[in-house]
């Protein structure tokens, strides 16, 4: 057959869904790969095809849309299972294509077993929340389309194994969980339980998120450099290892990107010819504050060294601070001799 | 003493006006603690007697007014059950006439200080005032180049000045003025505002467009580490798919043993318009099976390349 | 031509939710304040909210603070309401209000009915 | 919060005759008062801000004049589709207050 754009095997979108549950699933083409839609793809006469691989196995085979109660069916550019099977696992290629165009992606598809308290290798997204904030919420995610808004779901939320009732500052509120003031103790994995009716059938869409509780942006404050201080003084001879730490407090701070960074003399380290090595180690609070520590270090100092300026500076979506060491030469004691 | 020095906060300061400063800092001022304020590393507290010019209330240290020798280092100390913590102020105080001076010639002004209106849009200018609960503070007025604001795109509300439909005239020097009033005595408090403004970001076109590389050459030493960015605009509602490949395949593809060569992890910063995407390429080591070959950033239907060269012998 | 248009409303026992939203077009919807106000059956308007044009500046009615949230997606020209813990009293046609000179209404929708009743 | 009370509650009058509304704030609003007017089954249409500009596309028998605390709302000559209620709104601060409304019905 004539040549066909293909993608490959899209390994960024490992889907993975629950046994025995609606999955409904886009061909990755409209999503990422294609400039246009479904919608105009099909009124310029392409047609989009779908086949698949299944686990362990070479061989692409047609997806069987004739499966009783149509288990699996196609509606415009997605592919769906009411409800998918364990052996549904494997590599899923949707193919859009006419006489003169062709262009192709495949995906993983994971069908995966949960247990009574919903525990299952899916990989959770996580919702962080603000300690202490005010209320906030968490929603059901991934619900969207599986019913239309005239279907009225019921939904049920479990902390871990146990369904949210009476819980004193979790209240469930349909699609949402409401935090009335969230603490350290409602971090944990939370599951919304959707069940749907569809021509007869009733349905379920298990959803499980992980909730981190971190640092409120009410508490967050510009970095904090807690060494090097104005109290210690790094007195070295020649010769003698220099070892001077950067310890920085950093609050959290939501998709903020924490920098240290050492300047020697107003210049990176990596762009001086002295010989110095940093070593960086990064701590976490529960809140997910961070202490990042850089331990700069100089083997053999030579009294040169001892004169250079060594400032640590630290950055934050908060500010930006520095500090400078204080470094000098170790007067040496006086020598005497007895005539 | 045992007290662990936990960071130095510079606040400039201007002369003959009440200032407050709140001794907090979250991991430790959220528990039981106590909190005591000391002036340049004397060991007698400051007073906290409600008379006094500078005296201690609850966490805060309250200056009324702030003179111009006062300035200085104060330390406050916060003392848990187990734990003591010091935190350093390092006051500058200045004699600051609000109509004779632009404000933009103090140093490193804070935030508070510098403000910005985004032109077209109904937006507000902040003015700061932190003070303890004892202080009561009057309705504000707002001057611009010392003259009070009136005119129908201005409201004052609270602590906000509200100004509708911000055009390029309203940059300039601001001041915010509210009377103070502490155990029946009143004071003038005036904050000089910077306000720039900022432009709207034009776009246009809808397909993808890289701005960097722009099909070029890079001389680079063999061995060395290299990052190369590709900077893309585009509209907000794209659906393309931004990547570099060699060869026509992903480069986390082709180079997938070795993983010698990478693609970064998008970014994107969101502009009114348009986004600009960046998307970097890393190679680990640059070997001479790189020379000569097109690296291309894919945008959409948009490409453009990199080639890397070897640097020019230097004969000198 | 400018147009606003409520939706979410309904008929909701007291104690429980409402989400209600605005969709903004024929505006630069991301240039301006959105209020919220709502009118009883057969009273008068009361304001409830407003949200500056990047979230930084938002304000209630004392009979709605702590209970109500706004919010605003200016990628997708809307707003919203987010009503808790809903009392009879809060039964009222609720209209958005684009803010002209920030706090007076230059465009209103049509509105929305809540109607919470056990 | 500042309280606005309109005055008459409702307004007896026939085409073509002159309507005054009166609009009072418990304190000074300076000239943060606009007029909205509201038919049945419609939203309310803004008329008058900052006390005595007309709005894009109301008539000129439309007039506000005052400021601090009175206000008055003059409609010149009344015409049928001028009959509705009246609201006075503050932006001097929040909350945003409205006043009860004037009825303006035919007589």
């Known amino acids: 057959s004539e040549r066909c754009d293909d993608w490959g095997l899209d390994t960024m979108r490992q889907i993975q869904v629950f046994e025995d549950e609606p999955a409904r699933i886009k061909c990755p083409l409209f999503e990422h790969f294609l400039k246009f839609n479904y919608s105009t793809a099909h009124s310029a006469g392409l047609t989009l095809i779908w086949y698949w691989t299944r686990q362990d196995r070479d061989l692409e085979e047609p997806i069987n849309f004739r499966l009783p109660e149509n288990r699996i069916s196609k509606e415009k550019d997605v592919l769906w299972f009411r409800p998918t099977l364990l052996n549904d696992t494997g590599n899923y290629t949707c193919m859009l294509r006419n006489t003169t165009y062709c262009s192709k992606v495949a995906f993983p598809l994971e069908v995966v077993q949960k247990d009574s308290c919903f525990n299952s290798p899916m990989k959770l997204p996580v919702h962080k929340l603000y300690i202490e904030y005010g209320i906030q919420r968490i929603t059901c995610p991934n619900v969207d389309g599986y019913f239309p808004s005239s279907v009225k779901p019921t939904i049920t939320w479990y902390m871990g194994c146990y369904k949210i009732q009476n819980f004193n500052n979790v209240i469930p509120e349909g699609m949402n969980l409401s935090f009335l003031i969230a603490l350290i103790s409602n971090n944990g994995n939370y599951t919304c339980v959707v069940t749907y009716p569809e021509n007869g059938r009733t349905f379920h869409l298990t959803r499980t998120l992980t909730v981190k509780v971190v640092g409120s942006p009410k508490n967050a404050v510009p970095p904090v450099i807690h060494s090097p201080n104005d109290h210690v003084v790094y007195e070295k001879e020649p010769g003698e290892e220099l070892l001077i730490p950067c310890t920085v407090y950093f609050s959290f701070l939501m998709d903020s990107r924490n920098e240290v960074w050492w300047t020697i003399d107003g210049k990176k380290p990596d762009d001086i010819t002295i010989d110095v090595t940093i070593n960086e180690s990064i701590s976490h609070s529960r809140t997910e504050d961070e202490t990042r520590t850089q331990i700069l270090s100089i083997k053999k100092v030579t009294s040169e060294d001892l004169k250079r300026s060594y400032v640590c500076h630290a950055r934050s979506a908060k500010g930006e601070v520095a500090k400078a060491a204080k470094v000098k030469q170790k007067v040496p004691a006086p020598r005497y001799t007895v005539e | 003493d045992g007290c662990k020095d936990i960071f130095m906060k510079n606040e400039i300061l201007s002369a003959s006006q009440p200032f407050a400063f709140n001794c907090t800092f979250p991991p430790i001022t959220s528990g039981e603690v106590s909190v005591t304020w000391y002036k340049n590393s004397s060991k007698i507290p400051v007073s906290k007697i409600i008379q006094s010019r500078i005296h201690q209330d609850e966490t805060w240290i309250l200056f009324l007014p702030m003179e111009w020798g006062d300035s200085g280092v104060y330390q406050c100390v916060i003392k848990g059950r187990d734990s003591c913590h010091r935190i350093h102020v390092n006051l500058t105080v200045f004699e600051k006439h609000w109509c004779d001076t632009s404000i933009g010639g103090l140093p490193n002004l804070s935030d508070e200080y510098k403000q910005i209106l985004h032109l077209g849009k109904d937006d507000s200018l902040t003015c700061h005032l932190h003070f303890p609960k004892s202080c009561v503070l009057g309705p504000i007025k707002w001057y611009k180049d010392c003259n009070e604001i009136k005119g129908e795109r201005f409201t004052v509300l609270e602590t906000r000045l509200l100004v509708s439909n911000v055009s390029a005239e309203d940059r300039g020097n601001y001041a915010c003025q509210a009377i103070l009033t502490h155990s029946g005595k009143q004071y003038e408090v005036l904050n000089g505002i910077t306000v720039s403004i900022t432009e709207r970001a034009g776009y246009g076109g809808s397909v993808p467009k890289i701005i960097y590389p722009k099909n070029h050459s890079i001389e680079v030493q063999l061995g060395t580490t290299l990052i190369v960015d590709c900077n893309v605009t585009d509209t907000k509602d794209n659906t393309n798919l931004r990547c570099w490949r060699v060869n026509n395949t992903l480069v986390d593809d082709y180079y997938d043993e070795s993983k010698r060569i990478r693609e970064g992890v998008e970014t994107h910063v969101s502009f009114r318009e348009h986004n600009l995407y960046t998307v970097n390429i890393t190679f680990l080591e640059v070997k001479m099976e790189d020379y000569g070959l097109p690296f291309m950033c894919h945008a959409g239907v948009s490409t453009a390349y990199i080639i890397l060269q070897l640097p020019a012998p230097d004969f000198r | 031509e400018v147009q606003l248009v409520e939706s979410g409303g309904g008929l909701v026992q007291p104690g429980r939710s409402l989400r209600l939203s605005c969709a903004a077009s024929g505006f630069t919807f991301d240039d301006y304040a959105i209020h919220w106000v709502r009118q009883a059956p057969g009273k008068g308007l009361e304001w409830v909210s407003v949200?500056?044009?990047?979230?930084?500046?938002?304000g209630y009615a004392d009979s709605v603070k702590g209970r109500f949230t706004v919010s605003r997606d200016n990628a997708k020209n809307s707003l919203y309401l987010q009503m808790n813990s809903l009392r009879t009293e809060d039964t009222a046609l609720y209209y958005c209000?684009?803010?002209?000179?920030?706090?007076?209404?230059?465009?209103w929708g049509q509105g929305t009915l809540v109607t919470v009743s056990s | 919060e500042i309280v606005l009370t309109q005055s008459p509650a409702t307004l007896s009058l026939s085409p073509g005759e002159r309507a005054t509304l009166s609009c009072r704030a418990s304190q000074s609003v300076s000239s943060y008062l606009a007029w909205y007017q509201q038919k049945p089954g419609q939203a309310p249409r803004l008329l008058i801000y900052n006390a005595a500009n007309r709005a894009t596309d109301i008539p000129a028998r439309f007039s506000g004049s005052g400021s601090g605390t009175d206000f008055t709302l003059t409609i010149s000559s009344l015409e049928p589709e001028d009959f509705a209620v009246y609201y006075c709104q503050q932006r001097s601060n929040w909350p945003l207050t409205f006043g009860g409304g004037t009825k303006v019905e035919i007589k």
């Open positions: 209000a684009k803010g002209y000179n920030w706090n007076f209404f230059d465009y």
């Open positions: 949200i500056s044009w990047n979230s930084d500046i938002i």
